[in-house]
Interface confidence: low
């Protein structure tokens, strides 16, 4: 047994300058830290529980964020983070430190939490050694910290597995022998193989089970006859008739997750490590008290005994411990080639030119879905669209009522008349054309195309609004 201790020295912007947090907190805030320990150096599954333990720090002093000013080192909670461990210290472990910010505004439902930074490091560390210092970057943040593992008496040693007591308290008692030289302590004999018979077995090396005379079997629980071997019950050798050890229920160790097996009559029993229970230590016994939910996940006690807790994950996280960040951009939510930005608290799409909308779903260059009011028609061109409006209407969407004669379209003093299908110009003497734009020569010949037969100079010229150059 022992305690893992973590001391946070500073948390603030790294050399690159002030991080720009996507959360943009307003009002007072305070920091707190969460530490999670997992056994082994292997790449742990992200959602695996903190099997060695977890701890939450106290809240730090209140501070107020200055959005424009570069953030200094942020004020830290007092004291150590301590994670007690009941069994042997594994020596190799994964250390996960999360920095959380608590916003103390007037949010409905209490303070809001947001994860500022998370560092994960695999480390080797012997118990009883000095403090190990570390500096880790998490995005633009920098975290400085120290950690150590120490045993709690009577456990001593690099794994806290040697059980010692001061000699002054009592002389080395039965089964105990002196510790290493220069230590005023006594030490237990090596730990034999799990389930090794206390009466009939012994060991000189850890994990061993050697049998006293008259006993056999992997755990020294099977008696060996010294005479004819007849009359004994149990499996017998066909060649000698003598009893031979049958397969023991602990053969191969059926106990999962580091449990130790001991034989019982006709069966076995597993002694499970902290965090596991069940016939074969197969059920995770981590509870909400162990703080198994990451990233602000809400921990509730499982209704099923084999599910000691359930983490309800906030948006953007998944996994049984909310430790997997959902790569929401992998679902390609942004349409039309938009760039996806996962800001943590929200998704944003940066749209290419000509597209708009939360998911870049609107094509600004597309007449599809574009409504031109009052009978106007949508015209595409030049990477944009516009409405060509019916007579009497104008504006971007043809929603504004317009007077077709307001622009004085009839030249040379021609008179303009609004018409349901366009406008009509009544030209002054000497002019002709749809907009009275052509002078008539004194000899009666026009300089440009002559008026059609039957149309005298000065007669009104119909000019449909949607035709630019229409000559009769």
């Amino acid at each position: 047994a022992g305690v893992f201790e973590l001391q946070i020295h500073s948390f603030g912007p790294g050399p690159g300058g002030a991080p720009r947090s996507p959360y943009s907190a307003r009002g007072p805030c305070r920091l707190f830290f969460r530490v999670c320990l997992k056994p082994g150096l292997s790449e742990e599954a992200a959602e695996s529980p903190c099997a060695l333990g977890a701890a939450l720090s106290a809240r730090g002093p209140v501070y107020t964020e200055q959005p424009e000013a570069p953030a200094p080192d942020l004020p830290l909670p007092n004291g150590l983070l301590q994670v007690p461990f009941r069994d042997a210290w594994p020596g190799t472990f994964s250390l996960i430190i999360e920095t959380w910010r608590e916003e103390l505004g007037d949010q409905i439902g209490g303070p809001a939490w947001s994860l500022l930074a998370r560092v994960t490091r695999r480390r080797r560390l012997a118990a009883g050694g000095p403090w190990a210092g570390d500096i880790q970057r998490a995005g633009a943040w920098e975290l400085r910290f120290s950690y150590r593992a120490r045993c709690e008496l009577p456990a001593v040693g690099t794994a806290c597995t040697r059980l010692c007591r001061p000699r002054s308290a009592s002389r080395c008692g039965p089964g105990l022998r002196p510790c290493a030289p220069l230590e005023d302590e006594c030490e237990a004999p090596p730990v034999c193989r799990a389930g090794c018979s206390l009466e009939h077995g012994f060991c000189e090396q850890p994990g061993e089970c050697r049998c006293l005379e008259g006993w056999t079997g992997p755990l020294c629980m099977v008696p060996v006859s010294t005479s004819s071997c007849l009359g004994l019950r149990g499996p017998s050798s066909t060649t000698t008739g003598c009893l031979v050890p049958g397969p023991g229920p602990c053969d191969g160790n059926p106990c999962a997750n580091g449990g130790s097996c001991s034989e019982t009559p006709g069966s076995f029993e597993c002694t499970c490590p902290r965090g596991f229970y069940g016939l074969r230590c197969e059920v995770s016994g981590v509870t909400c008290a162990d703080g198994p939910c990451f990233n602000g996940g809400l921990c509730v006690g499982g209704a099923d005994p084999d599910s000691a807790y359930i983490c309800h994950c906030p948006p953007g996280f998944q996994g049984s411990n909310c430790e997997k960040r959902v790569d929401r951009c992998s679902l390609q939510p942004c349409r039309n080639g938009g760039l996806c930005l996962d800001l943590g608290h929200a998704l944003r799409c940066r749209c290419r030119a000509g597209f708009a909308g939360p998911r870049c779903e609107h094509d600004l260059n597309d007449c599809a879905g574009r409504a031109c009011a009052n009978g106007g028609t949508c015209v595409e061109g030049g990477g944009a669209h516009r409405c060509s409006c019916a007579l009497g209407f104008g504006g971007r969407d043809c929603r504004e009522r317009a007077d077709p004669c307001a622009a004085r379209p009839c030249a040379h003093g021609g008179r303009c008349y609004a018409h349901f299908s366009g406008l009509v110009c009544a030209c002054a003497p000497g002019y002709m054309g749809a907009r009275c734009e052509f002078p008539v020569h004194p000899d009666g010949v026009s300089a440009l195309p002559a008026a059609p037969p039957g149309l005298r100079p000065g007669d009104p010229q119909r000019y449909p609004h949607h035709h630019h150059h229409h000559h009769h």
Epitope: S42, A45, P249, D251, G252, N253, P254, A256, N257, S267, F268, Y277, G278, L279, R280, C281, E282, V283, P305, D306
Partner: antibody, heavy 118, light 113 residues
Framework: QVQLQESGPGLVKPSGTLSLTCVVF?????????WSWVRQPPGKGLEWIGE???????NYNPSLKSRVTISVDKSKNQFSLKLSSVTAADTAVYYC???????????WGQGTLVTVSS | DIVMTQSPDSLAVSLGERATINCKSS????????????LAWYQQKPGQPPNLLVY???TRESGVPDRFSGAGSGTDFTLTISSLQAEDVAVYYC?????????FGQGTKVEIK
């Protein structure tokens, strides 16, 4: 998605040794699962052969224990079955499967038919 | 070894009707420390490997339709298909995983009447 793939000779001579390998995809053989072998003679039911943990710990069906060896190769993320002194009664479809630590077999290979015949 | 006995050996049920399969173990598979029954149910269709339906005697595996349900404790267990569908035609096996040696029932064949 976890997938398991059995491989090995489909024909073994009587008194010989049957050897099969199961490669695991989508999960680490070093995870907290046991890895099992199950067989099914043609037209018959399922028979559990044994299991292995990544540490090398094994549990075997008592009726086959004297002939069975199951081992694990962590570097190749695979585990293997050896069944010695085979007879025609060992002709079966052999499946490898993942046993969640409790014991229910939640992922299975497609199975491979091994015929014992001379 | 714990012996698992299923009944009936085969079962013919009309589409939409209820099918019930029984499984009896020769000794209890209930582990008192966590009150769990170490029993699973599997479905096997021709030419396919078995597919886990239920574990802990009554916990449905992810993705299994809710018409499948397991019940029972100690030595007596049942698998019920509340409304038989055409795709449920298969052989169903129970399995105990108590201890260090596991055994299956002999199987129950479910057909459409």
């Amino acid at each position: 998605q976890v997938q398991l793939q059995e491989s090995g000779p489909g024909l073994v001579k009587p008194s010989g040794t049957l050897s099969l390998t199961c490669v695991v995809f989508g999960d680490s053989i070093s995870s907290s699962n046991w890895w099992s072998w199950v067989r099914q003679p043609p037209g018959k039911g399922l028979e559990w052969i044994g299991e292995v943990f990544h540490s090398g710990s094994t549990n075997y069906n008592p009726s086959l224990k004297s002939r069975v060896t199951i081992s694990v190769d962590k570097s190749k993320n695979q585990f293997s079955l050896k069944l010695s002194s085979v007879t025609a009664a060992d002709t079966a479809v052999y499946y490898c499967a993942r046993a969640a630590v409790a014991g229910a077999l939640d992922y299975w290979g497609q199975g491979t038919l091994v015929t014992v015949s001379s | 070894d714990i012996v698992m006995t299923q009944s009936p050996d085969s079962l013919a049920v009309s589409l939409g009707e209820r099918a019930t399969i029984n499984c009896k173990s020769s000794q209890s598979v209930l582990y008192s420390s966590n009150n769990k029954n170490y029993l699973a149910w599997y479905q096997q269709k021709p030419g396919q490997p078995p597919n886990l339906l239920v574990y802990w005697a009554s916990t449905r595996e992810s993705g299994v339709p809710d018409r499948f349900s397991g019940a029972g404790s100690g030595t007596d267990f049942t698998l019920t298909i509340s409304s038989l569908q055409a795709e449920d035609v298969a052989v169903y096996y129970c399995q105990q995983y108590y201890g260090t040696s596991w055994t299956f029932g002999q199987g129950t064949k479910v057909e459409i009447k």
